[in-house]
């Protein structure tokens, strides 16, 4: 049985994802996506403008980024947040900004976080402000697996493309 | 003896690491460039110090890393702020932090923003301030473009080789 | 059968992927290593669970990653702090708030930070507070270096696996 | 050498269903997805959806979701698409794939054709 | 859905010509579209991926071209067992989703 009788991280090493036996070894899927400056009050990927790109077989489905061969993967997103004051007499509630990759596979009836950022801010104290959020890791995924974002404060994100995107390249 | 007589970065640079003598295939485009601690005013990047490199072909050119060859790269930065309080007295201005990463190319007459992080900071209220900011990502580069930063704070920065950095790698 | 009657991430463990049995040029080593949140009041690097792993010969030693081979790593580590407001009557002090990447090798007496972010928080400003830090660089490693971790701020670390984690992988 | 063969096609009566399997062999079957194509007569290929018999992950064309279910037997390393509530539009030869990069599909069965109809 | 429009829907061809056939996608896709092609009774075959890459096994006369909406496939000189249907498929949103074919007959 694979790993019997080895230490937790030798049987974690021993237990890894398939490798593909492909001709065109040389391929190297990679995508980056910027987020749909012409949709304001969502978060909708595009990979066919600017800087964004899909290759080697990533592909979208339903705003979510496709794997296309089992194997490491390193993903990771950005989004930046900004907003302006409360005026002095509305009450200063704090604002709960996240962001986050989750990994969708049906072996689980719910989406698995595999990035999270996460900040409070207090917009009657501190005026106009802004805030940038940032992460990538590197995970093992298989072919056919859905990764895609949650974010909390949409209405607040700078969508640009270099401000709001995620991304995620085969090791 | 590698590095002997040498200032402990200049030992660094020095004692690299054996290098294979590998088909061109192999060749693995990488840098990584630290913020000169000794320019307080600007922010120079420097490739021969500390833990700092270029190898199989990048070059730094005018402050810019000059892509080698055609290809999807993952590009990164990030920078370190810190100020102090403002006196009880002064006007409490706020501060823009911004920090950018630049493309320039042929294709295109002015500079492209790659990747941005910004954040309005207001020393009055908080005292001594210290912010981090990163950012990194996949995109497509052709031969000969320039990556550049620019950066709005830069009186600010915490030059250190673990706080300001730039740097990319082929995929 | 696989993960049957487990926990998502003990199933997630149970289930993982075939090695294949590749020729030495193609191993790619990588790990990715989450914070223990069994652990409240330290920071324990765990590879044995949840979508850590360990491969192609890296090892955790004394709570540090074990460089295998000598070249250039992706290094990259994140962290997520959280607190609640001082009580009314208590005096604000500010809390420091720090993490760094750092490595340990034969060639020097010490460690030597890689990658550093800082954040000052003044939790009586600003009630809850939740702050998110993340950085990553390439560097070259060599065989038997010992990459670690050091955190100001422990007992705020939100201990989870898509928040707290730490990794490297060859270029 | 891979191999993908398709059985269980024939005639079906309308509001009836189907299940069609796709034996795979000549590589580790849980290394892929395994796609269902289908081709109506003398028309283009549309694509139906898919499954990882690896993790049992799966994703269809919102055309098909709510009648076709895609699933797999590793311990048989076959594949299988169930379609209920056939209509005569249904008719078509249906392919099973398995592709190199997902997307693309790199390796067909012969195909196996359902034919609805009373 | 996006949706795949070939051109010409047939045509007639002599060995040796070079063949041109031409897909437009009703939105841009990138340059995610791949090339099949179908002789009678028989399965699809991958002939080229990524818009212009040449899939394993695939003569040399078979290439691509494009981006963004319009793509190209082109046989440089047309052989005896080229005679079939091509069809192009975009491979940058799901539905995945194929033309309606060309035929290429013997003239």
């Known amino acids: 049985l694979p790993g019997v009788g080895l230490t937790p991280s030798a049987a974690q090493t021993a237990r890894q994802h398939p490798k593909m036996h492909l001709a065109h070894s040389t391929l190297k899927p990679a995508a980056h996506l910027i987020g749909d400056p012409s949709k304001q009050n969502s978060l909708l990927w595009r990979a066919n403008t600017d800087r964004a790109f899909l290759q080697d077989g990533f592909s979208l489905s339903n705003n979510s980024l496709l794997v296309p061969t089992s194997g490491i993967y390193f993903v990771y997103s950005q989004v930046v947040f900004s907003g302006k004051a409360y005026s002095p007499k509305a009450t200063s509630s704090p604002l709960y900004l996240a962001h986050e990759v989750q990994l969708f596979s049906s072996q689980y009836p719910f989406h698995v976080p595999l990035l999270s950022s996460q900040k409070m801010v207090y917009p009657g104290l501190q005026e106009p402000w802004l805030h940038s959020m940032y992460h990538g890791a590197a995970f093992q995924l298989t072919q056919g697996d859905q990764l895609s974002t949650h974010t909390d404060g949409i209405p607040h994100l700078v969508l640009s493309p270099s401000t709001v995107f995620f991304g995620a390249f085969a090791l | 003896l590698p590095g002997v007589g040498l200032t402990p970065s200049a030992a660094q640079t020095a004692r690299q690491h054996p290098k294979m003598h590998l088909a061109h295939s192999t060749l693995k485009p990488a840098a990584h460039l630290i913020g000169d601690p000794s320019k307080q005013n600007s922010l120079l990047w420097r490739a021969n110090t500390d833990r700092a490199f270029l190898q199989d072909g990048f070059s730094l050119s005018n402050n810019s890393l000059l892509v080698p060859t055609s290809g999807i790269y993952f590009v990164y930065s990030q920078v370190v702020f810190s100020g102090k309080a403002y006196s009880p007295k002064a006007t409490s201005s706020p501060l823009y932090l911004a920090h950018e990463v630049q493309l320039f190319s042929s294709q295109y007459p002015f500079h492209v923003p790659l990747l941005s992080s910004q954040k309005m900071v207001y020393p009055g209220l908080q005292e001594p301030w210290l912010h981090s900011m990163y950012h990194g990502a996949a995109f497509q580069l052709t031969q000969g473009d320039q990556l550049s930063t620019h950066t709005d704070g830069i009186p600010h920065l915490v030059l250190s080789p673990s706080t300001v950095f730039f740097g990319a790698f082929a995929l | 059968l696989p993960g049957v009657g487990l926990t998502p991430s003990a199933a997630q463990t149970a289930r993982q992927h075939p090695k294949m049995h590749l020729a030495h040029s193609t191993l790619k080593p990588a790990a990715h290593l989450i914070g223990d949140p069994s652990k409240q009041n330290s920071l324990l690097w765990r590879a044995n669970t949840d979508r850590a792993f360990l491969q192609d010969g890296f090892s955790l030693s004394n709570n540090s990653l074990l460089v295998p081979t000598s070249g250039i790593y992706f290094v990259y580590s994140q962290v997520v702090f959280s607190g609640k407001a001082y009580s009314p009557k208590a005096t604000s002090s500010p809390l420091y708030l720090a993490h760094e990447v750092q490595l340990f090798s034969s060639q020097y007496p010490f460690h030597v930070p890689l990658l550093s972010s800082q954040k000052m928080v003044y939790p009586g400003l600003q009630e809850p507070w939740l702050h998110s830090m993340y950085h990553g660089a390439a560097f070259q490693l060599t065989q038997g270096d010992q990459l670690s971790t050091h955190t100001d701020g422990i007992p705020h670390l939100v201990l989870s696996p898509s928040t707290v984690f730490f990794g490297a992988f060859a270029l | 050498e891979v191999q993908l063969v398709e059985s269980g096609g024939g005639l079906v009566q309308p509001g009836g269903s189907l299940r069609l399997s796709c034996a795979a062999s000549?590589?580790?079957?849980?290394?892929?997805?395994i796609h269902w194509v289908r081709q109506a007569p003398g028309k283009g290929l549309e694509w139906v959806g898919y499954?990882?018999?690896?993790?049992?992950?799966?994703n269809y064309n919102e055309k098909f979701k709510g009648r076709a279910t895609i699933s797999s037997d590793k311990s048989k390393n076959t594949a299988y698409l169930q379609m209920n509530s056939l209509r005569a539009e249904d008719t078509a030869v249906y392919y099973c794939s398995r592709p190199t990069m997902l997307p693309w599909f790199a390796y067909w069965g012969q195909g196996t054709l359902v034919t609805v109809s009373s | 859905d996006i949706q795949m429009t070939q051109s010409p829907s047939s045509l007639s061809a002599s060995v040796g010509d070079r063949v041109t056939i031409t897909c437009r996608a009703s939105q841009a896709v990138s340059s995610a579209v791949a090339w099949y092609q179908q002789k009678p009774g028989k399965a699809p075959k991958l002939q080229i991926y990524?818009?212009?890459h040449r899939y394993t096994g695939v003569p040399s006369r078979f290439s691509g071209s494009g981006s963004g909406t319009d793509f190209t496939l082109t046989i440089s000189s047309l052989q005896p067992e080229d005679f079939a249907t091509y069809y192009c498929q975009q491979h940058y949103y799901t539905p995945w989703t194929f033309g309606q074919g060309t035929k290429v007959e013997i003239k």
């Open positions: 499954n990882n018999p690896y993790n049992d992950g799966t």
């Open positions: 000549g590589y580790t079957f849980t290394s892929y997805v």
């Open positions: 990524s818009a212009s």
